[in-house]
């Protein structure tokens, strides 16, 4: 384990830090320039540093769980959990799921009345009894209740002709109910006569494209529990269908652009205001389904199985029957799906803030094991056969109290988790022996808690009226800057640098801004290593016989040397054995010059001196020319012709001599003068 | 003007012990860090010690164990106990004082550890 932490001045905040943090509350386990961050480390550290081990603050994420023997069937258990955690810390419990046998059943058949429906409305008219005894061989107490569904009453939903308003069959003959979105025909009820009675009345309905209005009697069934009649048991909601259905975004065909609400708007048992929301989204409605324990099976024909096939793979305990053409079939449809569906257990929990994390190992009875899955999982399961499922919940931070509640999707039992934070520290302080503080604070964890006008390790420091922005205003470089860098303590207004863990490297300045070992490297070492240099504040001194901005350089001037062994012909300074040249003089050796100025118009009044011993410099040419000195014999150089201070034209060589405006100058004997006109 | 006279040094025998000193002047000294140099005839000179004003301290290896860097802020002086004198720890012994990236060095002491 490890323990990243950043600006930690107390146990709380080594313990949000990390799970590999932990705090010493030794005292005096800091020394002089010590920040009190170093108190804040991975258990061996401490260890390691002298904290003894009934000194290292180091508090555990834990779990305790509570039966409750109170009220009837338990499929769960334990019904509550109070987990205590600690940041980044998880704390794990188990929860069994024992499947009952004869576990209590409301069936809620939701049919589609489209035209297309017609042969299997007339068997499902006969089937109340079927479906009662079908349950009763599963359960004690079952009970059954229908609705209907069509579709939209708008174009293009459905042909909005006053005529095939009243009779929306193609069959004029055919008694036919006008379209609606959702009835709720019958309440659950265990009594089979009125689920005949009730669904004997019902007429079919017709609609004008495929689709169909099917999401949103469901969302209607599962957010009117009242109306439906819906216990707190096994909920199931067999949705008969021969097509598909409208999702959300469909329903702006028919110009209706507000979200649905997924609340309940059953007006004398119709879905009335279906005309004002948008069908629900698949999310939507798999999220209201789940929240209120709802599974529904999808009792669809051959063509369309595909389709909700798709569908149950998104909302979850859910199944797919095929269903025969005319609905002849589904009570042993149903029967199947159920068994599915009970045999597979989903643990799963409400929603959670991003603080928690919340994970599950499945450990299934037939030896299948699913791990760090982000809901439990469980195939196969049979009645009276335990399985169990760790759960594992994780805090980010230092958590509010709070609670959630798990529960197995399908079932009405529930595990109520309540969530604590985990950050305090339990200190042994001799926190009321304030002498330890100067008389001026008192000890939490190691550390001195100052009274108000006292600040300093040991409250050593009065603030004499001056607020801590002030006296920290002194530790700062400028207003941009960090306190002592970043790199200190700001006591009484001064920076007292930490001791560094990097060996060799020691923090000063006044901000302790400097220290000995940023400094640029040479071969892997700074300043290319103690041999060469030394580093002080990001600037390499180097040792004698040794240059460079690491000390990379032996210092040697060989190869600065031009024929005359002078170095960079004095033009220029020997950098690394290499030519800085002074402007415009070109390396290797500062020899030439290409682009300076030429010199001839600077020295013709000394030419005209040292040769002729007039001009403008003829009374003091020695001290007006330093740089020149007159050669006798012609010279190899710049040619120049410049007219003298007489008008007359003067021819002269210069040669350039090592240094900085140094020439050797040759001068014609014969000046070129011009007569002026007679 | 940064100043460093030092003080302390001489001839000793090996085993022995001996202490060295220096002073500085024309700077804020609580803001610096000092160090004790070495120089060996015909070596390069090294790192014996440093101290910041904080008392963070920096040894080199083989002098770790026998030489003690301490510092007075008060006094404005830095001061290098050395013990168990090898005859290796031969040198002129400078004085460093760093005042951010500007170093200035005392003019050196010799000791000498006679075998």
């Known amino acids: 384990q490890e323990c990243t932490k950043f600006k930690v001045s107390s146990c709380r905040e080594c313990i949000e830090s990390g799970p590999g943090c932990t705090w010493c509350q030794k005292l005096n386990f800091t020394g002089p320039g010590d920040p009190d961050s170093i108190r804040c480390d991975t258990r061996p550290q401490l260890l390691m540093r002298g904290c003894a081990a009934d000194d290292i603050m180091d508090p555990t994420s834990l779990a305790e769980t509570q039966e409750d023997h109170n009220g009837g069937q338990k499929q769960l258990s334990p019904q509550k959990v109070t987990l205590y955690l600690r940041p980044g810390q998880a704390a794990a419990f188990n929860v069994t799921f024992r499947r009952a046998k004869g576990y209590p059943i409301d069936l809620y058949y939701l049919m589609d009345l489209s035209y297309s429906m017609l042969d299997d409305l007339r068997n499902v008219k006969k089937l109340g009894g079927d479906l009662l005894r079908a349950l009763n061989e599963i359960t004690e107490s079952g009970r059954i209740g229908f609705g209907s569904f069509v579709d939209k009453t708008v174009l293009p939903f459905v042909n909005t002709h006053p005529d095939k308003l009243r009779n929306p069959c193609p069959n004029k003959e055919k008694e036919c109910q006008p379209p609606f979105a959702f009835r709720h025909v019958l309440k659950l009820t265990n009594n089979s006569n009125q689920f005949q009675t009730e669904v004997g009345k019902q007429l079919i309905s017709g609609n004008l494209d495929a689709p169909e209005g099917g999401l949103d009697a469901m969302m209607q069934v599962a957010a009117c529990p009242e109306e439906i009649g819906w216990r707190n048991v096994t909920r199931l909601l067999v949705f008969a269908t021969d097509d598909g259905f409208h999702f959300a975004g469909d329903g702006k065909l028919g110009a209706i652009l507000t979200p649905n609400d997924g609340r309940c708007h059953l007006e004398d048992n119709l879905y009335k205001r279906s005309n004002e929301f948008d069908y629900p989204s698949v999310g939507q409605l798999a999220h209201k389904l789940a929240e209120n324990n709802i599974q529904p099976i999808f009792a669809v024909t051959s063509r369309m199985v595909k389709t909700y096939e798709k569908l149950t793979e998104i909302i979850p305990k859910s199944a797919v029957g095929e269903l025969s053409e005319d609905s002849s079939n589904v009570v042993h449809l149903i029967k199947n799906a159920y068994n599915k569906l009970s045999s597979r257990v989903f643990l799963d929990h409400n929603a959670l803030p991003d603080t928690l994390k919340v994970t599950y190992d499945s450990f299934c009875s037939n030896g299948v094991t699913h791990r760090n899955q982000p809901r439990g999982d469980c195939d196969g399961v049979q009645i009276n056969v335990p399985i169990t499922f760790q759960v594992k919940v994780t805090a980010t931070e230092c958590i509010q109290e709070q609670s959630f509640v798990i529960r197995a999707l399908g079932f009405t039992d529930i595990v109520t988790v309540q969530v604590l934070p985990q950050c305090e520290c339990r200190c042994r302080d001799q926190s009321r022996d304030r002498s330890l503080c100067h008389g001026k604070g008192f000890l939490e964890c190691g550390i001195c808690r100052c009274d108000t006008g006292y600040i300093g390790k040991n409250c050593e420091c009065q603030t004499q009226g001056r607020s801590s922005q002030e006296l920290e205003g002194s530790c700062r470089k400028d207003n941009n800057s960090i306190i002592c860098s970043g790199l200190g303590d700001c006591v009484c207004g001064q920076c007292l640098c930490h001791t560094s863990d990097v060996p060799g490297k020691l923090i000063y300045g006044q901000y302790c801004e400097c220290d000995t070992i940023n400094c640029e490297r040479y071969n892997g070492q700074v300043c290319g290593g103690p041999g060469r240099g030394l580093c002080f504040c990001g600037k390499c001194r180097c040792h004698p016989g040794f240059e460079g901005s690491a000390c990379q350089c032996e210092r040697t001037t060989e190869g600065c040397l031009n024929p005359r062994r002078v170095e960079c012909s004095g033009r220029g300074r020997c950098r690394c054995n290499v030519c800085e040249c002074h402007s415009g003089y070109q390396l290797p050796l500062c020899q030439e010059c290409p682009g300076c100025p030429s010199p001839c118009g600077k020295y013709i009044s000394c030419a005209e001196c040292l040769k002729f011993e007039k001009g403008p410099f003829g009374k003091n040419c020695s001290a007006a020319c330093p740089g020149l000195q007159l050669s006798n014999n012609p010279v190899k150089g710049r040619t120049c012709k410049e007219r003298d201070s007489e008008g007359c034209w003067v021819a002269y060589t210069l040669e350039q001599q090592d240094g900085m405006d140094r020439y050797l100058i040759y001068v014609d004997e014969s000046r070129e003068c011009v007569a002026g006109p007679n | 003007e940064v100043q460093l006279v030092e003080s302390g040094g001489g001839l000793v025998q090996a085993g022995g012990s001996v202490r060295l000193s220096c002073a500085a002047s024309g700077v804020i000294f609580r803001f610096v860090l000092m160090g004790w140099y070495r120089q060996a005839p015909g070596k390069q000179r090294e790192l014996v010690a440093q101290?910041?004003?904080?008392?963070?301290?920096n040894y080199a290896d083989s002098v770790k164990g026998r030489f003690t860097i301490s510092r007075d802020n008060a006094k404005k002086t830095v001061d290098l106990q050395m013990n168990s004198l090898k005859p290796e720890d031969t040198a002129v012994y400078y004085c460093?004082?760093?005042?951010?990236?500007?170093?200035?060095w005392g003019q050196g002491t010799q000791v000498t550890v006679s075998s």
């Open positions: 460093l004082l760093a005042r951010g990236p500007d170093v200035y």
């Open positions: 101290i910041t004003s904080s008392d963070a301290t």
